[in-house]
Amino acid sequence: GELETSDVVTVVLGQDAKLPCFYRGDSGEQVGQVAWARVDAGEGAQELALLHSKYGLHVSPAYEGRVEQPPPPRNPLDGSVLLRNAVQADEGEYECRVSTFPAGSFQARLRLRVLVPPLPSLNPGPALEEGQGLTLAASCTAEGSPAPSVTWDTEVKGTTSSRSFKHSRSAAVTSEFHLVPSRSMNGQPLTCVVSHPGLLQDQRITHILHVSFLAEASVRGLEDQNLWHIGREGAMLKCLSEGQPPPSYNWTRLDGPLPSGVRVDGDTLGFPPLTTEHSGIYVCHVSNEFSSRDSQVTVDVLDPQEDSGKQVDLVSAS
């Protein structure tokens, strides 16, 4: 006869491990007992359990409550056992020794491999700002046994670097994603993907990128200078910019206070019926936590009585 077992039994941390040991003998042969022991190299054998054909299962104190026979129906030639709730410390070599009648003793070894699935964590880098050079966007760390694989899934252009660290019963991998921040990256997902044989599917952690920026400011409303004449109603200037975080707007007049009747409504400056008093240099000041920008325009209110139109200057400054 001969013993049938597996070279390697692989289980995920916390699962039950079936340690197979089946005696395939000739007809009439009987199994008297099966002894299971742990036999890691460099250490003496440590008994797990003894399966006796007459007296049943005896589990050694170190494995009390953790070793069982598989559920019935049971074949009398089957010496397999279940190791409940496998932990990392269970990983190693195991041996089953089968005493048969009349063929004698047989032994076989197997290796138990306990997979420890990683619990990845993603740590965002510092605040991203447009104009920075290559900057850490996020780092992702996963530790397990065996070492997990850590990659990135994103449409954003960047560079990655990885380090791995060997620990007592596992290996850790950390990967960093660096990029040159630009406003187009705002709201883009950056996903850390962790693969491991103990996972049914890849684990994914997504970080949404936020890049602070402030666009140049410009002022609309003076495109047709001929509309800016005495008596015109509904004249307005609109300040154009965009930013992250969203900017706030402030209007001032460079050559004095804002004329009475002029209304400030966020990015818009509304005028009452125009008079020559409304001529002047107006400044739109745009700011957010990241930066500030200015744009100034010169308003020249035309008097229809006069023939010659006057120039209108647009100046943008930051």
Epitope: Q88, V116, L119, S121, N123, G125, L136, S139, C140, T141, E143, G144, S161, R163, F165, K166, H167, S168, R169, S170, A172, T174, E176
Partner: antibody
Framework: QVQLVQSGAEAKKPGASVRVSCKTS????????IHWVRQAPGQGLEWMGI????????SYAQKFQDRVTMTRDTSTNTDYMDLSSLRFEDTAVYYC???????????WGQGTMVTVSS | DIQLTQSPSFLSASVGDKVTITCRAS??????LAWYQQKPGKAPKLLIY???TLQGGVPSRFSGSGSGTEFTLTISNLQPADFATYCC?????????FGPGTKVDIK
Amino acid sequence: QVQLVQSGAEAKKPGASVRVSCKTSGYTFTNYYIHWVRQAPGQGLEWMGIINPTLDSTSYAQKFQDRVTMTRDTSTNTDYMDLSSLRFEDTAVYYCARSAGFDAFDIWGQGTMVTVSS
Amino acid sequence: DIQLTQSPSFLSASVGDKVTITCRASQGINSYLAWYQQKPGKAPKLLIYSASTLQGGVPSRFSGSGSGTEFTLTISNLQPADFATYCCQQLNSYPFTFGPGTKVDIK
């Protein structure tokens, strides 16, 4: 706020063992690694080892490999560092510090003075 | 193990000065370097990580640069609170080692 609070000063004889504790609060315990660092009087900082927050796996500096044990108790959010076979040269301030992944140590305990003398 | 050396080991400076401290690694560590400030009887405080990234809440007069084997910590416009010992740390591989430190005191 985030805090790492260490146990009080210890005086030990050569050959004895010491246990230093580090109680963490203000953050999710399992998301950070804990390191132990020591500093002998008038000397620089010396990294002793690291413990994984979720797996109990460790890595120790070679120098301490045979004498140090780092453990944790998730029920109380406390880490422990045991150092055995103490020598005079183990007299130092022992710090615990946390790191997110393998980044720099952003929060440190206040330190525990361990004095070894006969 | 990766060795870190710092220069100078001692530095005298005045308030308002610009101070530069160098840290050299015995082998390449990419940008996996941190800088700490330590005052007597206190735990170290993180200033810079990833060689050049300023830790939140740290004044912008502190800056870091370098990669590979040579790194620099610069304090522009030195303030009274900055008189302390500064040390670097590599996080490229185990064991994570520290530099011996640079003591900055008042001239």
